[in-house]
Interface confidence: low
Amino acid sequence: LSTCKTIDMELVKRKRIEAIRGQILSKLRLASPPSQGEVPPGPLPEAVLALYNSTRDRVAGESAEPEPEPEADYYAKEVTRVLMVETHNEIYDKFKQSTHSIYMFFNTSELREAVPEPVLLSRAELRLLRLKLKVEQHVELYQKYSNNSWRYLSNRLLAPSDSPEWLSFDVTGVVRQWLSRGSELLGVFKLSVHCPCEMGPGHADEMRISIEGFTTGRRGDLATIHGMNRPFLLLMATPLERAQHLQSSRHRR
Amino acid sequence: LSTCKTIDMELVKRKRIEAIRGQILSKLRLASPPSQGEVPPGPLPEAVLALYNSTRDRVAGESAEPEPEPEADYYAKEVTRVLMVETHNEIYDKFKQSTHSIYMFFNTSELREAVPEPVLLSRAELRLLRLKLKVEQHVELYQKYSNNSWRYLSNRLLAPSDSPEWLSFDVTGVVRQWLSRGSELLGVFKLSVHCPCEMGPGHADEMRISIEGFTTGRRGDLATIHGMNRPFLLLMATPLERAQHLQSSRHRR
Amino acid sequence: ALDTNYCFSSTEKNCCVRQLYIDFRKDLGWKWIHEPKGYHANFCLGPCPYIWSLDTQYSKVLALYNQHNPGASAAPCCVPQALEPLPIVYYVGRKPKVEQLSNMIVRSCKCS
Amino acid sequence: ALDTNYCFSSTEKNCCVRQLYIDFRKDLGWKWIHEPKGYHANFCLGPCPYIWSLDTQYSKVLALYNQHNPGASAAPCCVPQALEPLPIVYYVGRKPKVEQLSNMIVRSCKCS
């Protein structure tokens, strides 16, 4: 390897080795290697080897740092948002509103307009504006999957709060799925109160948080203003023309 | 600032500025700044500003990289493990075993022996060896909190698998809590099947995964070997003497 | 990514992770670490060319930012990106200890 | 941490994050970015002294590893640690676009 001067590979390695010498002692806060005078003869105890293996397995399983950024992630992402279908739309009649769940419908054609191909989507967030909350509440997010089944996505423990606050859920995988399925016109999320197995439907806690966009009784301008704050999907995607550029530069390599 | 040559702060700043020029254009895949000839007069459209603000809010809320490593994390961590109290112990009689939950007791005096002070603990993982699983199962982990209440900790969607596999849950906060409370002799975890609100206790899915250490009918040597693979807490902590060293060097500063 | 898969199988002159196995006994003259006997420490090496953004050569420049200067640094430098910890076994007196040392193994590098 | 809190309020000669506000119009001569008008890009600068771990001076050396050479690099370098993205608004023809640029703001640096 050469820059201005020729790099002496062996010298670099030796410096690295010397640095590691200091590093290990330093990490263990030892001024010198510990004496071996009292070490018992024979192999290491089984329990110690087992513990070492457990630790090593953990190392193998998880990297300390995030994955290196894929090439496409270097480039800027276009940001768009798709608002939830308004609650006065008749499609909401399909699901009987309950005290422990709220439903959110999204028009997949609007999503496709924003992100023409699933592969272009780099991140999708479901954003909800929660209003004041007097007590802690544990909520779960689901995606409508097939006829009447729901797929669990994630959960959130919401602390009491005097002021409105935006909640954000990563729903990239779900939106990518919706974009791939041309047939589905609507995508549906459900936000439910968390129910431990010991409780039945009758005993389930009520949904104590108010989500902006589901607040009833507003009329005219005020309804419009608040309607803009209804749940929405925040989308980050590679614009089509940039993706094509990426593709062609990849072919050129 | 000086290294071998005096570093010209202004030059570095200018180079950075020039680099940013290229970086932004490059990220947008533009060869030159876009023409402004067609930009309509007046302020930005409200919807665009709203979208910009949504994106900016996200930026403010979350850093792209993990927090810088605190000083103590630089130093080595001692690794120990504390095995779950064996299931034939009478303390398990306190909780009626159900088809949708399993309970795991840990002796807090053993934890204190391994980690004398809560502040020394840097990570605690609950490790479970799950055996073969034929269908997908969604499980939740709870911590026993007060008399008969359980605090939700986390959840995991387990994919079908033909081979045994170690599951790991980060329970650092819980173990730190147990270490601070001298009065509690036992710490308890509960692993339950996830129950949507629509299902009552009678309809809850059964626990379909087998966890090593709860398998009945083993005797003698085989039971002992399998007992070693029962759930355990893997602890990583700063040894007391190293912590004191850290403390004193902090005071010396 | 400038990781072990790419760098160990290429003759990349620019920034890359370079192979380095540390044998505790042979390289450091240590017998006190019982497990492991050594480890693949690796290290980062190689120039990260500073990319000039002169109007006359913008087209060439823009394509190179991603690899050589993604952070738009004034003086990009080849440094570790992904690091992994290393658990070791050693004795203190008669007592064996297992300890984990953070950020010991370089898995990939980057120009930063 | 070599972050903005520490570095901007100190006269640290070694590796630190340095203050740099980029005004798109004034610094880059650009009028095409409508929002924001500029941003705190910052940058990393300062030496990361290579620490020789000679037996003769271990006591001095060991305390310095953490700050100056935590990765035990043969040639430690001052580089960004925490980075944040930047959203911008600009036009393409008559159409306004909001885009987010990753890793644009340096929040802290490290010797790596």
């Epitope: - | 030059l11 200018r14 500025i17 | - | 004034k26």
Partner: antibody, heavy 120, light 107 residues
Framework: EVKLVESGGGLVQPGGSLSLSCAAS????????MSWVRQPPGKALEWLGF??????????EYSASVKGRFTISRDNSQSILYLQMNVLRAEDSATYYC???????????WGQGTTLTVSS | DIQMTQTTSSLSASLGDRLTISCRAS??????LNWYQQKPDGTVKLLIY???RLHSGVPSRFSGSGSGTDYSLTISNLEQADIATYFC?????????FGGGTKLEIK
Amino acid sequence: EVKLVESGGGLVQPGGSLSLSCAASGFTFTDYYMSWVRQPPGKALEWLGFIRNKPNGYTTEYSASVKGRFTISRDNSQSILYLQMNVLRAEDSATYYCARYTGGGYFDYWGQGTTLTVSS
Amino acid sequence: DIQMTQTTSSLSASLGDRLTISCRASQDISNYLNWYQQKPDGTVKLLIYYTSRLHSGVPSRFSGSGSGTDYSLTISNLEQADIATYFCQQGDTLPWTFGGGTKLEIK
């Protein structure tokens, strides 16, 4: 329109002191580094120093020839740049220009200049 | 300090001519080379910065080129208004330094 107007030049005896001013308008003064440059009669331009902008804490940098004798300061509320000159010598006789300095290493706008003569 | 040398101290040319003024740095200045025009009344204006980038309002008949240590300013189609002294300046390393100037006269 960017405008820089210097004032305060005149005749001073060797060893004396003088303060030059530069009134700035047409731009946000605090956003810019401001610089002083001089030109002795029939000679080249010489950079004397600059004072940094608000994000950079209004710190100063000087050339070796004037360091310790000349001081650059600014009144941001009035958008005025100053050059305080002490222990003046004959070789300090020149036309003094104030200039706006940018991060690109160049001076993009200059004043018309004010003349200093140091003579007994 | 970096020395900037303009070897030609004065230059005569005719209106409409194309002429080049050169400037040499005592070390590589990485394209941080700027050109200024000083009119006979003492007024100074920036013409070109960063070797080749034209400052706003400067006619396109002015152009700059060069790299490393050697740089030049070219004026094509010389006009009466261009009669002035031209200075180069390096912006690579403090202290900023100027060339001695090249005085342009009409034949």
